[in-house]
């Protein structure tokens, strides 16, 4: 399922366009509890994967394409 | 190639009970949400349920309470348990495949079973 | 949940263009998918994500979201073309369709 990784937001921010002033703190996460497909806004929220949306919290998840980390997959993977 | 069947259905009176079953084949089942799409004789698409592929299960309001979706992965089957069935039941189900996670779009269907409720 | 609302009937002549209409408030922030339904068969995906085309539905169908209208055209409509045609969208953890528009080829 590649990594999986939650961004802590819920202000409803959209966090795809540029000037987007999108939260910086981020954490990693485990795949747990129910995931949908994350609302349109979100459609460039993850650089290189597919976003996920958490379902009890609202928020958006990445799983990252392979050779790619980082809670938007923004970062390519050194140890791939 | 990717194939859904879908059965169960039949004549039932207001009130009885009824599973439908979808038996899919030609793609890793247990990978896809899944849902159940109905269509009164006549009328438009009605989503019914929804079920993902870690358990997370959603209802439509009018089947909340009385139909009951399910799974097994190591049969590659899914289920639509319905109790309390009323008139207004009667459709033809059909099962069909979510993209990925729930929230995308239905890229395969089954050809669909008539339920039928009536005294 | 979001309510999406389609013309009960079009009408286009053979190799004219079919313009098929899904209103939502908003709609326009939500993707967008389109079904083929032809008489005693399974709906059929012809369009997702507001405007891709699935692999093997003719290039003619194509699709737009914008605003509170997404729209379903199908260029150089063909007698095969004639179905039902429902437009279908994600709102609040559950599944909304149109209540379907029939295409009829004159």
């Known amino acids: 399922d590649g990594n999986s990784t939650r961004s802590p937001e819920t202000n409803g921010l959209l966090c795809g366009d540029p000037e987007e002033n999108c939260a910086a703190t981020t954490t990693q996460s485990k795949r747990k509890g129910h995931f949908s497909r994350c609302p349109k806004q979100y459609k460039h929220y993850c650089i290189k994967g597919r976003c996920r949306f958490v379902v009890a919290e609202q928020t958006p998840s990445c799983v990252c394409d392979e050779g790619y980390i980082g809670a938007r997959c923004e970062r390519v993977d050194l140890f791939y | 190639q990717v194939q859904l069947l879908e059965s169960g259905g039949g004549l039932v009176q207001p009130g009885g009970s009824l599973r439908l079953s979808c038996a899919a084949s030609g793609f890793t089942f247990s990978s896809y949400a899944m849902s159940w799409v109905r269509q009164a004789p006549g009328k438009g698409l009605e989503w019914v349920s929804g079920l993902g592929h870690v358990g997370y299960t959603t209802y439509t309001d009018s089947v909340k309470g009385r139909f009951t979706i399910s799974r097994d992965n190591s049969k590659n089957t899914l289920y639509l348990q319905m109790n309390s069935l009323r008139a207004e039941d009667t459709a033809v189900y059909y099962c069909?495949?979510?993209?990925?996670?729930?929230?995308?779009?239905?890229?395969?269907w089954g050809q669909g079973t008539l339920v039928t409720v009536s005294s | 949940d979001i309510e999406l609302t389609q013309p009960p009937s079009v009408s286009v002549s053979p190799g004219q263009t079919a313009s098929i209409t899904c209103s939502g408030d908003?709609?326009?922030?939500?993707?967008v998918h389109w079904y083929q339904q032809k008489p005693g068969q399974a709906p059929v995906l012809v369009i997702y994500?507001?405007?891709d085309r699935p692999s093997g539905i003719p290039e003619r169908f194509s699709g737009s979201n914008s605003g509170n209208t997404a729209t379903l055209t199908i260029s150089g409509t063909q007698a095969e073309d004639e179905a039902d045609y429902y437009c279908q969208a994600w709102d609040m953890q559950s599944v909304v369709f149109g209540g379907g528009t029939k295409l009829t080829v004159l």
């Open positions: 069909a495949r979510d993209y990925l996670d729930f929230g995308y779009y239905f890229d395969v």
């Open positions: 908003k709609i326009g922030k939500k993707y």
């Open positions: 994500d507001d405007s």
